[in-house]
Interface confidence: low
């Protein structure tokens, strides 16, 4: 019968002939009376056999990622008679893996959005690298993820590639971060190959800033002839947040005379001071009122940022009009 062991050839061998093993018949007594032949895909081009001994050699560099096994056929013939000594037999040559492929991130570019001020541990995004090497061959395709850039704000789980927040971030200071993740095979051991990817992490706004008046004192004037409903001027607050988090409502905090009102222009986010009751220069020629400003939408959990509303003082001078 046929005698052989399992055949393996390492991929990417640089030698011009690599001995893989020997195929032989147990009837072969070593007197060179038998001839061995190799048939099938790769016979004669990738693999050759020593016709006398049955020794098999690989004569080309192989790439496991291109082809991981070869199925060949062997024959042994008695030279004197030309007859087959053994029935033709099929055998397999397996290409064994070496760590010649670096991990690759196939889904890049990565981009994620996470709310500012998110607590430590908040999941941002998961990045995944793939390695073309053999996952069943040692650690060639076992990956470990690490953070090359992004400390101290982000961390990555070494085995999953899950990126989490490790320090609170304030959008008003910096609104986006580039994080660079490295995937290393061989679980980081010597000879490891690595791949990197960049993740753009954008911070979405939360309402962590209250509106604050630009001025602590506004001076306005109103003619005593002005009818009720007249707009007599505008006041303005600024809010470092954006979008609906910067929408605000102005109101009167103090007006003993109950002469004025403030309405909010939601287009411009300005407060418009309105005359609620007609004024009379001869009766009172100036007024002092206090206005306050608050955000329109403040979720319960963000109320701590909005404890005391910003206020401003408005001095209103009444202009005299000649009366008949």
């Amino acid at each position: 019968g046929w005698v052989w062991n399992q055949f393996f050839v390492p991929e990417e061998m640089n030698t011009t002939s690599h001995h893989i093993g020997q195929l032989r018949s147990d009837l072969d007594n070593g007197n060179n009376s038998f001839q061995y032949k190799l048939l099938g895909a790769g016979a004669g081009s990738t693999f050759i056999i020593d016709e006398r001994t049955g020794d098999i050699y690989a004569i080309q560099k192989l790439d496991r990622e291109e082809r991981s096994l070869y199925i060949l056929r062997a024959q042994v013939i008695d030279i004197a008679t030309g007859r087959a000594v053994e029935p033709e037999s099929e055998f397999v040559i397996k290409v064994s893996d070496i760590n010649d492929n670096e991990p690759k991130f196939l889904d890049e570019p990565y981009e994620a959005i996470v709310p500012e001020m998110s607590p430590e541990g908040t999941l941002v995004i998961q990045v995944t690298a793939s390695d073309a090497d053999d996952p069943s061959s040692g650690n060639n395709a076992r990956l470990l993820y690490s953070l090359l850039q992004g400390q101290p704000y982000f961390s990555v789980e070494p085995t999953t590639g899950v990126i989490r927040i490790s320090s609170k971030m304030d959008r008003e200071l910096q609104d986006e971060y580039w994080v660079i993740i490295q995937a290393k095979d061989m679980i980081g051991q010597p000879g490891a190959l690595s791949g990197t990817t960049s993740v753009l992490i954008k911070l979405s706004d939360v309402n962590d800033n209250k509106p604050i008046f630009k001025e602590s004192l506004y001076r306005l004037t109103v003619s005593e002839s002005a009818p009720t409903g007249t707009s007599i001027g505008t006041i303005m607050a600024y809010d470092n947040d954006i979008g609906e988090n910067a929408e605000m409502d102005y109101s009167i905090e103090e007006d003993d005379s109950q002469t004025f009102d403030i309405i909010t222009n939601h287009e411009t986010q300005e407060g418009i001071v309105i005359l609620k009751k007609k004024v009379d220069f001869e009766h009172q020629n100036h007024y002092g009122i206090r206005a306050k400003v608050k955000n329109h939408h403040v979720p319960e959990q963000l109320m701590k940022y909005h404890t005391e509303a910003s206020t401003t003082f408005i001095k209103i001078q009444v202009e005299d009009v000649d009366e008949p």
């Epitope: 670096e102 090359l148 850039q149 992004g150 200071l173 910096q174 971060y177 580039w178 660079i180 690595s194 990197t196 960049s198």
Partner: antibody, heavy 120, light 110 residues
């Protein structure tokens, strides 16, 4: 907008030291690395080292180790590069360049350059 | 002698496509992002391509970058006279623990 403004040209004698400054504005100074790159007349670009303005950590190119010192002043958003034991081959334009948040990123903004001439 | 090898010069006529190569090793181009800089005569360098193939805003899409193994290249299509400049590749080198630049390529628009 981001701006890096460097100090003016210098003429130094061999053996002396030179200190070049680079004032940053338009961004959070402590969040970005700053590198120094030089270019000798008619030559290519050569990286000298990098400093992180937040902690002051530095990494210097092997070639300049022992001769270059990079420092920063966070109160004025300024980084400094001092090169000692000057020789004629140190005649070059010295650029500060903002390196991305960490070393693996690009230099996205550059100073206008400072010409240092070393001549006896 | 630069760690990254670039051709010293390249040329083309307006409208043509030119490619500038940058060859390195496993410790630099093989394992890190490649960046390209353009330096117009008498000015500071300007970022042209970052992280292998990304263009900063304001850089025309005529400029493109690519990387394969330990080599990178910069392609400029529809060449214009204002592209006449020096071009440098740059990458972080893990062995040297520092940035390395190519020797630069002087592009002439004929």
């Amino acid at each position: 907008q981001v701006q890096l403004v460097q100090s003016g040209a210098e003429v130094k004698k061999p053996g002396a030291s030179v200190k070049v400054s680079c004032k940053a504005s338009g961004y959070t100074f402590t969040s970005y690395y700053m590198s120094w790159v030089r270019q000798a007349p008619g030559q290519g670009l050569e990286w000298m080292g990098i400093i992180h303005p937040s902690g002051g950590d530095t990494t210097y190119a092997q070639k300049f180790q022992g001769r270059v010192t990079m420092t920063r002043d966070t109160s004025t958003s300024t980084v400094y590069m001092e090169l000692s034991s000057l020789r004629s081959e140190d005649t070059a334009v010295y650029y500060c360049a903002r390196g991305g948040i960490k070393l693996w990123l690009h230099f996205d903004y550059w100073g206008q350059g400072t010409l240092v001439t070393v001549s006896s | 002698q630069s760690v990254l090898t670039q051709p010293p010069s390249a040329s083309g006529t307006p409208g043509q496509r030119v490619t500038i190569s940058c060859s390195g090793s496993r410790s630099n181009i093989g394992s890190n992002f490649v960046n390209w800089y353009q330096q117009l005569p008498g000015t500071a360098p300007k970022l042209l391509i970052y992280t292998n193939n990304q263009r900063p805003s304001g850089v025309p899409d005529r400029f493109s970058g690519s990387k394969s193994g330990t080599s990178a290249s910069l392609a400029i299509s529809g060449l214009q006279s204002e592209d006449e400049a020096d071009y440098y590749c740059a990458v972080w080198d893990d062995s040297l623990n520092g940035w390395v630049f190519g020797g630069g390529t002087k592009l002439t628009v004929l």
